[in-house]
């Protein structure tokens, strides 16, 4: 058997620096939550911890404070390099600046793939636009590789501004041709990684053949199994188990939002690739995890501009 | 096990070239970036290239830019270093190292071959 | 180029000694240092990585600690295997550089 740790985000919109509970500004440092600097050092300390770790976002990072007002992107793709996160699906917010905001702040400057498979750019775009976001990546883990496939709400068009240009797929029919490219190429992992909500988490976990982990966002959802740590109410247990249509056992997982917790699910893998076991929780990103010290000084250090453009 | 052995060393005059194989073993090589570290005798450690698991990028040391390629054979289990318009301070002991398997970003060197030595000399 | 400065270069120690090296890099390199010892006509050997973790197989008198621009390397209890060459190494970006080497000699 092989394990797996899936260190997941989602819906951060722009939460770089710490919040209250409520996710609203900080005013009480010693009660606040979340924020770049202690998500780093808890997901340093589990990957110290675990030998096999993915950190992996699932879409809207862009909207939220004055953060993305004034930096538009580029603070995403400089504290996710920071981070050194793994993989993001495109969520729909971030395309609140047109194509060319996500094109220039992040998709050229993210070290890590970004991904959506039913996204499909048409046009004079499709060149400009080729190979900076894919629609699936293959992870090498250890000695290990996990598939990582992407998608993002097709209701993105209504909901933000991504142009003439993009055509938003059906989701599952957009996974299902890729996954099966997935499974030719030999990679008996895959974790579908996107933006379109929970409902559509779990239809993508019953209809996919060969995903065998969702992790989602766009709704926000909690899951929590035993006693939430905070006021935030679950809507299920972590991780929520779907059975697919093939009869497998599928694990589903978001992790609420606005960095306020960090999402971990420990996947056991057979030699076939099968899932065995699934299990963890979200991880509430409370003051008792102190904040790295040196991606606070870099969160100081832009956040001099802001207190500018605040006066 | 794990293992890393360099070949292709030897003496050589300024100007020549040389080539530097690692033959991996014991794990999945074409999961793994790989670098070339070098040993000048009595000296300390200088990182020289780097080339990612799935070969998409490489990156080299300003002092071999333009001279030194890096290159893999996953199908082989082998790294390379070719040395081109070798110089007298290339003179050093090549080791080749795997990285910790940080993806797409740099890393630290969790497994080190026994070094192969070159020596450019007149 | 990251700058990584190695202090002290060479240091005398008796076994059972706690022996502290430093290595301070000349911009902030969050947690991404590795240390690595290495023996005469031997490759060096991975110590620590991530600032603070322990490679397996490693024995547990070795530690690290430090965030952003200054790390240090500990040896809780010198011991006759330990007198060696330590180099720090930062993997924060391109090009990977190294500490200049602490000789650790036995008194």
């Known amino acids: 058997a092989w394990e797996l740790t899936i260190l997941h985000t989602n819906d951060v919109h722009s939460r770089l620096e710490q919040t209250s509970e409520d996710s609203s500004k900080c005013v009480n440092a010693s009660r606040c939550m979340g924020g770049v600097a202690r998500l780093f050092t808890k997901v340093q300390q589990i990957r110290r911890a675990e030998p096999n770790v993915l950190l992996l976002d699932a879409g809207d990072q862009y909207q939220g404070t004055i953060w993305f007002t004034v930096y538009k992107g580029a603070e995403v793709a400089h504290f996710m390099n920071a981070l050194r996160y793994d993989a993001m699906a495109l969520g729909n917010h971030e395309f609140d600046n047109g194509v060319e905001g996500l094109i220039e702040p992040l998709l050229k400057e993210a070290k890590f793939p970004i991904l959506s498979a039913n996204i499909k750019a048409k046009g004079p775009l499709a060149s400009q636009i080729s190979g900076l976001y894919l629609p699936y990546k293959v992870l090498p883990v250890g000695d290990e590789v996990v598939g990582i496939v992407g998608y993002t709400s097709k209701e993105t068009p209504f909901l933000s501004n991504p142009g003439t240009n993009l055509v938003f797929e059906d989701e599952i029919t957009a996974l299902q041709p890729e996954v099966d490219k997935l499974k030719t190429l030999n990679v008996n992992k895959i974790i579908a990684l996107g933006h379109s909500g929970f409902e559509m988490d779990k239809l993508i976990a019953q209809k996919v053949r060969g995903v065998d982990v969702v992790v989602g966002g766009h709704s926000n959802t909690f899951l929590y199994t035993g006693n939430p740590p905070s006021k935030e109410v679950p809507a299920g247990k972590y991780p929520f188990i779907v059975t697919s249509d093939d009869g497998r056992k599928v694990p589903v997982v978001q992790a609420y939002a606005f960095g306020k917790y960090l999402g971990y699910l420990k996947i056991e893998f057979d030699e076939r690739g099968n899932v065995i076991s699934s299990h963890g929780n979200p991880i509430l990103l409370n003051s008792s995890i102190p904040e790295d010290p040196s991606i606070k000084a870099d969160i100081n250090k832009w956040r001099i501009k802001l207190d500018n453009y605040s006066t | 096990q794990v293992q890393l052995v360099e070949s292709g060393g030897g003496v050589v005059q300024p100007g020549r070239s040389l080539r530097l194989s690692c033959a991996a073993s014991?794990?999945?090589?074409?999961?793994?970036?790989m670098h070339w570290v070098r040993q000048a005798p009595g000296k300390g450690l200088e990182w020289v290239a780097v080339i990612w698991y799935d070969e998409s990028n490489k990156y080299y040391a300003d002092s071999v830019k333009g001279r030194f390629t890096i290159s893999r054979d996953n199908s082989k289990n082998t790294l390379f270093l070719q040395m081109n318009s070798l110089r007298a301070e290339d003179t050093a002991v090549y080791y080749c190292?795997?990285?910790?398997?940080?993806?797409?970003?740099?890393?630290?060197?969790?497994?080190w071959g026994q070094g192969t030595m070159v020596t450019v000399s007149s | 180029d990251i700058q990584m400065t190695q202090s002290p270069s060479s240091l005398s120690a008796s076994v059972g000694d706690r022996v502290t090296i430093t290595c301070r890099a000349s911009q902030g390199i969050s947690s991404w240092l590795a240390w690595y010892q290495q023996k005469p006509e031997k490759a060096p050997k991975s110590l620590i990585y991530a600032a603070s973790s322990l490679q397996s197989g490693v024995p547990s008198r070795f530690s690290g600690s430090g965030s952003g621009t200054d790390f240090t390397l500990t040896i809780s209890s010198l011991q006759p295997e330990d007198f060696a060459t330590y180099y720090c190494?930062?993997?924060?970006?391109?090009?990977?550089?190294f500490g200049g080497g602490t000789k650790v000699e036995i008194k």
């Open positions: 190292a795997r990285g910790y398997n940080s993806r797409w970003y740099p890393d630290a060197f969790d497994i």
């Open positions: 014991g794990f999945t090589f074409s999961n793994y970036g």
């Open positions: 190494q930062q993997y924060n970006s391109y090009p990977l550089t």
